[in-house]
């Protein structure tokens, strides 16, 4: 369902209560109008839980290319550059929506798909299980 | 234009070189079939750069609800629980695709939109600018 009043200029919808197949304009609108000066792409090197970025390409997916984070260490990097294994580097994961070509190879027909991607890593205190 | 063999069951495409308006099935397919046991939702509390999650809702967007991370501190939390301001908690941001209703209020017509979301926080060594 969707907010009313419904715009009279809307394309026709077979099932107006909950459309399952919709029209999507692929001309991407960018909400991030200006480059965010606080946004740094070198955090992956400067973090105490640094990560590498791995390229994942799937031509049947939109976007085709996704760069995924993989933590470099099990532990976290200390000020002296050594790894502290009393702490853990863990991936921060996020579920994102992508479009999957359906049927395969079709240029203009997709299905929404939810995938889990690792965006970066963070340093956490481990959960210690005490044995009675 | 897309890879061939082009599926003969594809919906028609007006401009085969670069389809701008496509059909999308909103029945979401979830690729993350099993719940990942390693995927923890308490990292935001256990991290040395902890964060709070803020709900962002927009009925004209799909998905309408997005949770955004905001770092709790400027510095990073040490083992003793105090904040170390010689280190910085910074948001890990990712550009994601969402669907924006276009025209507004239309139930079955969208445009792809790119938005920047903060997924979590990580602890980084600050960049020190030395003054001559």
């Amino acid at each position: 369902g969707i907010a009313i009043p419904r715009n009279s200029g809307c394309p026709n919808s077979e099932d107006k209560n909950f459309p399952r197949t919709v029209m999507v304009n692929l001309n991407i609108h960018n909400r991030n109008t200006s480059t965010n000066p606080k946004r740094s792409s070198d955090y992956y090197n400067r973090s105490t839980s640094p990560w590498n970025l791995h390229r994942n390409e799937d031509p049947e997916r939109y976007p085709s290319v996704i760069w995924e984070a993989k933590c470099r260490h099990l532990g976290c990097v200390k000020a002296d550059g050594n790894v502290d294994y009393h702490m853990n580097s863990v991936p921060i994961q996020q579920e994102i929506l992508v479009l999957r070509r359906e049927p395969r190879h079709c240029p203009n027909s997709f299905r929404l798909e939810k995938i889990l991607v690792s965006v970066g890593c963070t340093c956490v205190t481990p959960i210690v299980h005490h044995v009675a | 234009g897309i890879a061939i063999p082009r599926n003969s069951g594809c919906p028609n495409s007006e401009d085969k070189n670069f389809p701008r308006t496509v059909m999308v099935n909103l029945n979401i397919h979830n690729r993350n079939t099993s719940t990942n046991p390693k995927r923890s939702s308490d990292y935001y509390n256990r991290s040395t750069s902890p964060w709070n999650l803020h709900r962002n809702e927009d009925p004209e967007r799909y998905p309408s609800v997005i949770w955004e991370a905001k770092c709790r501190h400027l510095g990073c939390v040490k083992a003793d629980g105090n904040v170390d301001y010689h280190m910085n908690s910074v948001p890990i941001q990712q550009e994601i695709l969402v669907l924006r209703r276009e025209p507004r209020h239309c139930p079955n017509s969208f445009r792809l939109e790119k938005i920047l979301v903060s997924v979590g926080c990580t602890c980084v060594t600050p960049i020190v600018h030395h003054v001559a």
Epitope: I28, S41, D42, L53, E57, W67 | -
Partner: antibody
């Protein structure tokens, strides 16, 4: 109009490094990866690697891993390729080319004009 | 690495001829890309995703193939078509190119 404008020709000594720039205009810089390809005199094309200006991610042809460094500056929409420990066989024209992250079917669609790097003692 | 072998390496033909260039991959690949390059110039994307003509490419060009064998065909050769053509694969790392086919005027 989409343009990839590369820096000028370079003459380098063996063992030194070279840094080639590629200034992009006419499109959203972070929507495209930048790939680097080289062509030795009278030879074919050889892929060096890719940089994603959006995430900072890089991936290299193993042949160049450790010697090539690909970077990008989003604020100036400029990509860079640095090649170290130069040898005579690195003498080539170096090209940058863009690659759409969202629809990879389109491949490498626009190319820079090329930068000639000559390695000679 | 996936090797791409183009044949012939060079070809002399006349205006109006039908010309076919083949590209054979050492392993199966999903798509092939073709680039045209003229002396002293940058390569130009010519055919992408095996079959699709890049913007501005005349319809006398066509691409076909699957698996390991791909072809670029020019139905009626024109003076501006004389150039070197490279095939390219990006199904497997490292991405590779064929050695090129130089198309010359007879």
């Amino acid at each position: 109009e989409v343009q990839l404008v590369q820096s000028g020709a370079e003459v380098k000594k063996p063992g030194s490094s070279v840094k080639v720039s590629c200034k992009a205009s006419g499109y959203t810089f972070t929507d495209y990866e930048i790939h680097w390809v080289r062509q030795a005199p009278g030879q074919g094309l050889e892929w060096i690697g890719v940089n994603d200006p959006e995430s900072g991610g890089t991936f290299y042809n193993q042949k160049f891993d450790g010697r090539a460094t690909l970077t990008a500056d989003k604020s100036t929409s400029t990509a860079y390729m640095e090649l170290s420990s130069l040898r005579s066989e690195d003498t080539a024209v170096y090209y940058c080319t863009r690659y759409y992250r969202y629809e990879s079917f389109y491949g490498m669609d626009y190319w820079g004009q090329g930068t000639t790097v000559t390695v000679s003692s | 690495d996936i090797q791409l072998t183009q044949s012939p390496s060079s070809l002399s033909a006349s205006v109006g001829d039908r010309v076919t260039i083949t590209c054979s991959a050492s392993s199966s690949i999903s798509y092939i890309y073709w680039f045209q390059q003229k002396p002293g110039k940058s390569p130009k994307r010519w055919i992408y995703a095996t079959f699709e003509l890049a913007s501005g490419v005349p319809s006398r060009f066509s691409g076909s193939g699957s698996g390991t064998d791909y072809t670029l065909t020019i139905s009626s050769l024109q003076p501006e078509d004389f150039a070197t053509y490279y095939c390219h694969q990006r199904s497997s790392y490292p991405w590779t190119f064929g050695q090129g086919t130089k198309l010359e005027i007879k």
